[in-house]
Amino acid sequence: KKEDGESTAPTARPKVLRCKCHHHCPEDSVNNICSTDGYCFTMIEEDDSGTPVVTSGCLGLEGSDFQCRDTPIPHQRRSIECCTERNECNKDLHPTLPPLKDRDFVDGPIHHK
């Protein structure tokens, strides 16, 4: 039941967005394309051996603002870029790893828990 003053106009449904996915393809993806109500992303991060790994895919609307904010994580070199302006927009995203800090040279790629 609608409360007094509550709009009866239907809320706009999000339009599905198609994104390229690589190393991050969900079970419903086809030909390395996934679908989302949120953002396309491309991310670069170091694996346990210090090798840069690029992944791309779909981020759902819920929580994606936080995930796309690219807040630095101690002892983890990682960068993420997000987009929504067109389908497969993440094909054109090329995030780069943040520069090594002095302490990172000492710690190496070991991730402290």
Partner: antibody, heavy 117, light 113 residues
Framework: QVQLQQPGAELVMPGASVKLSCKAS????????MHWVKQRPGQGLEWIGD????????NYNHKFKGKATLTVDKSSSTAYMQLSSLTSEDSAVYYC??????????WGQGTTLTVSS | DIVMTQSPSSLAMSVGQKVTMSCKSS????????????LAWYQQKPGQSPKLLVY???TRESGVPDRFIGSGSGTDFTLTISSVQAEDLADYFC?????????FGGGTKLEIK
């Protein structure tokens, strides 16, 4: 209100091509995907493909690749589907339908395509 | 391609009776990321275009009478008409929108006795 207007019928010769139209009104064309669906008598519904009018990005059912080409004219809010090398198998009702997600919340009235000499 | 199978292919019911029709998919339509089933139901009255009744397996489209109830999860889905009316004479189709190409069931024809 949302309307998808399609011509009622088209009669085309075998081997020819046809361009079916779907004029959208009552909503912002670029906020929804536009789909095309084929229905032959007694053979249910078949999804042909879809187009995002905002960037003309298309997806096709592999069964219709090479047969159907989807385009859109934003200035007239009209979506088009061109069907080539027509045979009697292409005789059917063709619907346009819009979606936000990939369920179809508004449908055109359909164009009956007859391929005959 | 995901195969959608509907049963029965036709049924005849009297006004006021409860109707149930089944739709089965060849693979699960439940998306793990949001726990939604990517299945829709449509009604097509004679000489008309299809009309959306239910999406995400159980969400009734705005303006659809509440006698139409969608249920099920994974691979098994049901459309129930709690008390059939004369105007419900139509073909009913299910559609999966989990993975491209989107596919429809063969339909259930509802006749009124």
């Amino acid at each position: 209100q949302v309307q998808l207007q399609q011509p009622g019928a088209e009669l085309v010769m075998p081997g020819a091509s046809v361009k079916l139209s779907c004029k959208a009104s009552g909503y912002t064309l670029t906020n929804y995907w536009m789909h095309w669906v084929k229905q032959r008598p007694g053979q249910g519904l078949e999804w042909i493909g879809d187009i995002d009018p905002s960037d003309t990005y298309t997806n096709y059912n592999h069964k219709f690749k090479g047969k159907a080409t989807l385009t859109v004219d934003k200035s007239s809010s009209t979506a088009y589907m061109q069907l080539s090398s027509l045979t009697s198998e292409d005789s059917a009702v063709y619907y346009c339908a819009r979606s936000g997600w990939d369920y179809f919340d508004s449908w055109g009235q359909g164009t009956t395509l007859t391929v005959s000499s | 391609d995901i195969v959608m199978t509907q049963s029965p292919s036709s049924l005849a019911m009297s006004v006021g009776q409860k109707v149930t029709m089944s739709c089965k998919s060849s693979q699960s339509l439940l998306k793990s990321s949001n726990q939604k089933n990517y299945l829709a139901w449509y009604q097509q009255k004679p000489g008309q275009s299809p009309k959306l009744l239910v999406y995400f397996a159980s969400t009734r489209e705005s303006g659809v009478p509440d006698r139409f109830i969608g249920s099920g999860s994974g691979t098994d889905f049901t459309l129930t008409i709690s008390s059939v009316q004369a105007e419900d004479l139509a073909d009913y189709f299910c559609q999966q929108y989990y993975r491209i190409p989107w596919t429809f069931g063969g339909g259930t024809k509802l006749e009124i006795k």
